[in-house]
């Protein structure tokens, strides 16, 4: 299937999502991420599967990946902590915590995002914001500037239909509609934000994008509150 991208979205307002991170491999954007604490970025575990021999860094305060911006800063990664139960061949537990080499310098363009701790499903139909630098067409067009799209949450029963994800969506995952507007693997690790709170992280499993019968899958952060707290402690 086509590699991940935000489809049907538009350029985000510059620096209006100060929690947004670009996880980079050898200087190139690899995945999205979200600043959840001064020294910690949450992303997707699968992002680092093929990064064993490369240099992983985190870019904060960016809108454009290529242009100079006063708020932009690239941080080395001190420690990468994938969820202990994440596995290459499943979408379950697809979370990764990256400890930055130092505390991020906070400001208007760099600020952690509050994340959901109450383990309760987001109501179907709720409009949530997903952002990323993932590719935006079938020929791999890479946006220089951050893109975003608003997507309605889809109920788990519909998402688990045989014609959709056929029972793969556990209670620790959530879905959003994908009819021409969608997020995908290139946006993996990025945030799904509902009502100003981080509710989900884009999973990095391969799937067809922009097809309404293959909704976007997101890891529910509230379901992993204990693990996140234990790593950040």
């Amino acid at each position: 299937p086509p590699r991940g991208r935000i489809l049907g979205g538009r350029e985000a307002e510059a620096h209006a999502r100060p929690y947004m991170a670009s996880v980079q491999l050898n200087g190139a954007h690899l995945c999205g991420g979200v600043l959840v604490a001064e020294q910690w970025v949450l992303s997707a575990a699968h992002c680092l599967e093929d990064a064993a021999d490369g240099k992983v860094q985190v870019l904060l305060g960016a809108h454009s990946l290529s242009q100079p911006e006063p708020s932009k800063r690239l941080y080395d990664v001190l420690r990468a902590v994938p969820h202990p139960d994440s596995q290459p061949d499943t979408i379950d537990h697809d979370l990764l915590l990256l400890q930055l080499s130092e505390k991020a310098t906070l400001g208007p363009a760099v600020r952690p995002l509050p994340w959901q701790r109450v383990d309760r499903d987001v109501a179907p139909g709720t409009l949530c914001d997903v952002a990323g630098w993932g590719i935006v067409n079938h020929a791999g067009r890479r946006p220089d500037s951050l893109q975003h799209v608003l997507l309605p949450v889809l109920d788990r029963a519909t998402c688990n239909r045989r014609t959709h994800h056929d029972g793969a969506i556990t209670e620790r995952l959530m879905c959003a509609e994908s009819n021409r507007r969608d997020s995908c693997k290139g946006d993996s690790g990025g945030p799904l934000v509902c009502g100003g709170v981080l509710e989900g992280v884009v999973t990095s499993g391969s799937r067809v994008c922009g097809n309404r019968k293959k909704p976007g899958i997101y890891t529910r952060v509230a379901s992993y509150a204990a693990w996140i707290d234990s790593v950040l402690a």
Epitope: N26, A139, R141, R142, D144
Partner: antibody
């Protein structure tokens, strides 16, 4: 620094096939898609298609479907384009070019000149 | 597919001049417009993308502008190495398409 190395020229017979190579260096090969572009003598540029080296996903210009086949060998950081059932219309310079931002192609190979002649 | 038109196929100018090369798309391409330079030996280089961002290593005498369907590349204070052919390319709609090129010659 980013480099894309292509052989200078290929002389091939009509009706046969040719496989052009593009060896990448100076960057992580699997992190950037690779485009192929055709230029007929004295003419403009035509986009053939693109391949994602990380999973070999391809997207072709409809005009070149069945004519061009894009592949990669990640172990040698090399992209390939095979052209089949060659005719004089396929005589051209073929470029590989790395995928840049916003639909641009940021680094180009020197091009391989293909001459189809009996 | 989107047609890209460079109405001027060749242009003569002198060293130190300022020249503008134009490019028109057959429909709105939402700023996804890129400019390339091709030397006589076939070497192709990206100059500008989207449609005013300078690619790394490109001299600041090159600049791009435009929106919608009309775009232009300006080279100020022409230098010897700038005499080449310039192509525009749209990256908005598949398949990607190029203009026919404008050859910049020394007067």
């Amino acid at each position: 620094q980013v480099q894309l190395q292509q052989p200078g020229a290929e002389l091939v017979r009509p009706g046969t096939s040719v496989k052009l190579s593009c060896k990448a260096s100076g960057y992580t090969f699997t992190s950037y898609w690779m485009h192929w572009v055709k230029q007929r003598p004295g003419q403009g540029l035509e986009w053939i298609g693109v391949i994602d080296p990380s999973d070999s996903y391809t997207y072709y210009n409809q005009k070149f479907k069945g004519k061009a086949t894009l592949t990669v060998d990640t172990s040698s950081s090399t992209a390939y384009m095979q052209l089949s059932s060659l005719t004089s219309e396929d005589s051209a310079v073929y470029y590989c070019a790395r995928n840049g931002y916003d639909g641009a192609m940021d680094y180009w190979g020197q091009g391989t000149s293909v001459t189809v002649s009996s | 597919e989107i047609q890209m038109t460079q109405t001027t196929s060749s242009l003569s100018a002198s060293l130190g001049d300022r020249v503008t090369i134009s490019c028109r798309a057959s429909q709105d391409i939402s700023n996804y417009l890129n400019w390339y330079q091709q030397k006589p030996d076939g070497t192709v280089k990206l100059l500008i993308y989207y449609p005013s961002r300078l690619h790394s290593g490109v001299p600041s005498r090159f600049s791009g502008s435009g929106s919608g369907t009309d775009y232009s590349l300006t080279i100020s204070n022409l230098e010897q190495e700038d005499f080449a052919t310039y192509f525009c390319q749209q990256g908005n709609t598949l398949p990607y398409t190029f203009g026919g090129g404008t050859k910049l010659e020394i007067k």
